[in-house]
């Protein structure tokens, strides 16, 4: 950066490098260059040359001064105009931040995902502070008093291996940078109440041609929990509205439900599941969509909407159609 | 068994600055471990003044009344922990000690004998 | 900033007897508490540690109970070596900017 470059002289800021962002600035240039008493001094921001707010101190020193600084990172660096020298000469350079100092870590969740092998922390961090804002998770033993600390920049994976302190602990979040520090409330967690599932997916669907047609979507998880409660949501793609059927699952084999549906209407399915009686769901499964046939037989595959074809069999149409989910975060 | 062996006794006057020391020797300094600074005033309680973590990271941690006041460093090649100050007052006349479990846990089992600060002009 | 408020501040025995010394948080500690005795002259030692446990080589005449907000360190029988200022320690957590202090004011505790 510009901080990196030879000096013949000294430039500072006052209140700080890193300042709160909209404030009143200071940037001031003392120059120390042999055989020069400089005739001029030149502030310049990002490589552009500065024309107000400079004032004269001294023969060796100058003063830029801005107001309500709202730029997250400039290089600034001074120049003198010395007698008998055809270029200005640089004097000095530094990079300034301006931000804010971090919000209360809010929103602070823990969940271990069925087969991770990791406690995934995550939390609310507020606004954008703009400037490098580091974050230690705090994760203390309420059997052995035992803490570990963690240092991220964002959300932290920790080994259930390292949690060896028994099942209870508290977890807190430490937001720290240049301008301030703040930490969360403390959450209590179990690691036997965590647990998120392994996935649910929707496999296929199949409409059975019926006196009333019947919609039958397949679905499973990997998981090896044995009480898993699980939602599906459907509606419409030109519907706002979900509708939502709840079920008590036991994933030894591969979960029907069925549906009546209106005939010849594309629809969207989504399923998530949580331990029975857990605080943390899945995130919604990704975008399952199905259209329902007329009332002609027919059979969609693969994908979103694909040809359909006559099979005349009592399946009046299959679908194994997806799409990436829009909920991943969803777990509360 | 851990041993905290703190530095001598120290007379200073207003202004001058300071660093007492406590070595520790039976911890194991590649683990997780709080060492932290304790002080009591002639004639009074405990108060504590802060910790400095060392781990995989580095965190220091003071009561908000020694912040700015005093600063707590490691250096964990010699397993040695400090406490410092730049510039002296007649109040910071009192007994340091330094007190850890060897561990990441905050109760202190082990507790240094004590460095006693006098500043007089 | 959680403030530790021990009572009594002085507590007159007489050996053989029972003693008990409050520590109240003002709030939620969980079970982070540690117990100290200060004997004239010495740096403080460790007596109970996660409320209830007795630390190595402490005299199990010294018990602790309590979480939350409440805990009581009680002596069965006094003996005479006991005297000496005792503290409570909030051990939960040190890391929050606003703490001024993790121990209580400190309880003396002298023989009748």
């Known amino acids: 950066g510009i901080t990196n470059i030879n000096c013949s002289g000294h430039i500072w800021v006052e209140p700080a490098t890193i300042f709160k962002m909209g404030m009143n600035i200071s940037i001031y240039c003392q120059a120390a260059i042999k055989n020069c008493q400089p005739r001029k001094l030149h502030f310049y921001k990002n490589g552009i040359k500065e024309r107000f707010q400079i004032t004269r101190i001294n023969k060796t020193t100058a003063r830029l001064w801005y107001k309500n600084f709202l730029e997250p990172h400039a290089s600034m660096y001074c120049t003198a105009e010395c007698p008998k020298h055809f270029q200005e000469t640089l004097i000095c350079g530094k990079d300034i931040s301006s931000g804010y100092p971090p919000d209360i870590p809010d929103e602070v969740t823990c969940v271990i995902y069925e087969y991770s092998g990791n406690m995934t922390c995550t939390w609310n961090a507020g606004k954008l502070t703009y400037i490098d804002t580091k974050y230690v998770v705090h994760v203390k033993s309420l059997e052995t008093e035992e803490e570990q600390q963690y240092l991220t920049s964002s959300y932290i994976n920790i080994s259930t291996d390292s949690l060896q302190g028994g099942k209870k602990y508290l977890v807190w979040v430490q937001a720290a940078n240049a301008l301030g520090m703040e930490e969360s409330k403390q959450l209590q967690i179990h690691l036997d109440d965590i647990v998120i599932p392994s996935a649910a997916v929707i496999s296929r669907a199949e409409t059975i041609n019926a006196t009333v047609p019947k919609t039958i979507i397949y679905w499973d998880s990997q998981t090896t929990i044995e009480k898993v409660s699980c939602e599906m949501r459907y509606k419409a793609t030109t519907n706002q509205t979900w509708n939502v059927k709840e079920f008590d699952t036991n994933f030894t084999y591969v979960q029907q439900s069925e549906f009546y549906l209106e005939p010849n209407i594309k629809y969207v399915f989504q399923v998530r599941c949580q331990e029975t009686g857990k605080r943390y769901w899945q995130p919604w499964s990704s975008l399952f969509f199905h259209k329902t046939p007329e009332t002609v037989p027919q059979v969609t595959s693969k994908a979103f909407q694909h040809d359909t074809w006559n099979s005349g069999l009592t399946v009046a149409s299959i679908s194994t159609g997806h799409l990436t989910s829009d909920n991943r975060g969803d777990i509360g | 068994e851990v041993q905290l062996v703190q530095s001598g006794a120290e007379v200073k006057k207003p202004g001058e600055s300071l660093k007492i020391s406590c070595k520790g020797s039976g911890i194991d300094f590649n683990s997780n471990y709080y060492m932290c600074w304790v002080r009591q005033m002639p004639g009074k309680g405990l108060e504590w003044m802060g910790c400095?973590?060392?781990?995989?990271?580095?965190?220091?941690y003071y009561a908000n009344w020694a912040k700015g006041q005093v600063t707590i460093s490691a250096d964990k090649s010699i397993s040695t922990a400090y406490l410092q100050w730049s510039s002296l007052k007649a109040s910071d006349t009192a007994m340091y000690y330094c007190?850890?479990?060897?561990?990441?846990?905050?109760?202190?089992?082990?507790w240094g004998q004590g460095t006693l600060v006098t500043v007089s002009s | 900033d959680i403030v530790m408020t021990q009572s009594p501040l002085s507590l007159p025995v007489t050996p053989g007897e029972p003693a008990s010394i409050s520590c109240q948080a003002s709030e939620n500690i969980y079970s982070f508490l540690a117990w100290y005795l200060q004997k004239p002259g010495q740096s403080p030692q460790l007596l109970i540690y996660s409320a209830s446990k007795l630390a190595a080589g402490v005299p199990d005449r010294f018990s602790g109970s309590g979480s939350g907000t409440d805990f009581t360190l009680k002596i069965s029988r006094v003996e005479a070596e006991d005297v000496g200022v005792y503290y409570c320690?909030?051990?939960?957590?040190?890391?929050?900017?606003?703490?001024?202090?993790?121990f209580g004011q400190g309880t003396k505790v002298e023989i009748k």
């Open positions: 007190a850890t479990s060897g561990s990441s846990v905050l109760y202190f089992k082990f």
């Open positions: 400095i973590y060392v781990g995989s990271h580095v965190n220091t």
């Open positions: 320690q909030q051990t939960n957590r040190y890391s929050n900017p606003d703490i001024y202090n993790v």
